[in-house]
């Protein structure tokens, strides 16, 4: 996933704090194509531009994610920005027809660990959290942290709580989480590694 994701991120990073807030609120009510779910309000409102980009791409894929972002920007009166987003998305011959997902391109950020790079997608898509916690317990998670994550009611909130501890982790600790994810959610990791 390359050009479209970067174009979405560029657009969102160019919004003021007030505009970003307005964007999120409009995203909660914008009409969606049949078959696509809405990003949960609780998760949405606390996201920064980077998290929101990851969430848009993980929920809607790149092509539709960019189209949706442009629609919301247009609805906010930011026609020029919407036009720039769509132009960036359709540059060259890399554009796929509407509704068709272009083949993914590598856009890995060299300085970021997989865990940080895909934070939003992992929060949204990891299901087997209990096993992850057991795999990490005593290695990177204290008893107190383990209990705190388990106490959360949903998988996304569990993952969000788990991510609240990762800023203190070094690369090796994050590798342990990645390894546990590989073992318990192999298809998800393979999917994200391509992005």
């Amino acid at each position: 996933m390359g050009r479209a994701r970067d174009a979405i991120l560029d657009a969102l990073e160019n919004l003021t704090a007030e505009e970003l807030k307005k964007f999120k609120l409009k995203l909660l009510s914008v009409p969606l194509r049949e078959g696509y779910g809405r990003i949960p309000r609780g998760a949405l409102l606390s996201m920064d531009a980077l998290d929101l980009t990851d969430k848009l791409v993980s929920f809607y894929l790149e092509t539709y994610g960019a189209e949706l972002t442009a629609n919301v920007l247009r609805d906010m009166g930011l026609q020029e920005m919407a036009g720039q987003l769509q132009a960036a998305t359709h540059q060259g011959s890399g554009a796929a027809p509407a509704g068709i997902q272009a083949p993914p391109q590598s856009a890995a950020k060299p300085g970021l660990h997989f865990i940080d790079q895909h934070r939003a997608a992992l929060i949204a898509r990891v299901t087997n959290v209990e096993w992850l916690l057991d795999a990490l317990y005593g290695k990177v998670l204290t008893d107190e942290q383990y209990q705190a994550v388990r106490a959360e009611p949903t998988n996304p909130s569990k993952m969000r709580k788990l991510f609240s501890f990762t800023p203190a982790w070094n690369w090796t600790c994050k590798d342990l989480l990645l390894q546990a994810l590989r073992e318990s959610q192999s298809y998800l990791v393979e999917d994200l590694e391509r992005s």
């Epitope: 993980s58 894929l61 993914p104 073992e183 192999s186 298809y187 998800l188 393979e190 999917d191």
Partner: antibody, heavy 114, light 109 residues
Framework: EVQLVESGGGFVKPGGSLKLSCAAS????????MSWVRQTPEKRLEWVAT????????YYPDSVKGRFTISRDSAKNTLYLQMTSLRSEDTAIYYC???????WGQGTLVTVSA | QAVVTQESALTTSPGETVTLTCRSS?????????ANWVQEKPDHFFTGLIG???NRPPGVPARFSGSLIGDKAALTITGAQTEDEAIYFC?????????FGGGTKLTVL
């Protein structure tokens, strides 16, 4: 280049056993989920088993649960399918596949008949 | 147990664009179903075309693309060629099991 090469197929009587192997190359075998899929004589594709990267998580359809066991040896880059209590309806071409990326082997024929 | 449904047969002409779809009985297909598309040519020769909804393995022609359209997974062949005449199977992952569709027989004439 990803390559998957199956072996171990053959003719077996009902109630018998057979072990299939799949030699994988061209990718980091230990990082990926692997599966067995079969094509029945009626040309249907049926999923048979999946094993996640670490070998801890294995999944089977009810039709083979308790009779078939999927395993992997990451040191040898090899996937296995141990089949026991074979039935005539297990007759099929068995394919080793990395479905997350859509890579398939050439298949090995298993015939179960009296 | 989920049921995965494909068109039983489609016909197209060389150079035309054709879209095959894959529907789930449980609701909308999402990226978490990791839609997989495989082509079967005569003599049980299978070639994986798409994995993880939209990922094309190396060596697969660029005319094949995968996507989600509406509530279904889709395989689009842009500029079909006579050698694309084959049976196309899709498979969807449901958290702990794969389910294959019955296949679409594509005729190119």
């Amino acid at each position: 280049e990803v390559q998957l090469v199956e072996s171990g197929g053959g003719f077996v009587k009902p109630g018998g056993s057979l072990k299939l192997s799949c030699a994988a190359s061209g990718f980091t075998f230990s990082n990926y989920a692997m599966s067995w899929v079969r094509q029945t004589p009626e040309k249907r594709l049926e999923w048979v088993a999946t094993i996640y990267s670490g070998g801890i998580f294995t999944y089977y359809p009810d039709s083979v649960k308790g009779r078939f066991t999927i395993s992997r040896d990451s040191a040898k880059n090899t996937l296995y399918l141990q089949m026991t209590s074979l039935r005539s309806e297990d007759t099929a071409i068995y394919y080793c596949a990395r479905l997350g990326g859509s890579y398939w082997g050439q298949g090995t024929l298993v015939t179960v008949s009296a | 147990q989920a049921v995965v449904t494909q068109e039983s047969a489609l016909t197209t002409s060389p150079g035309e664009t054709v879209t095959l779809t894959c529907r789930s009985s449980t609701g909308a297909v999402t990226t978490n179903n990791y839609a997989n598309w495989v082509q079967e040519k005569p003599d049980h020769f299978f070639t994986g075309l798409i994995g993880g909804t939209d990922n094309r393995p190396p060596g697969v022609p660029a005319r094949f693309s995968g996507s989600l359209i509406g509530d279904k997974a889709a395989l689009t062949i842009t500029g079909a060629q006579t050698e694309d005449e084959a049976i196309y199977f899709c498979a969807l992952w449901y958290n702990n099991h794969w389910v294959f569709g019955g296949g679409t027989k594509l005729t190119v004439l």
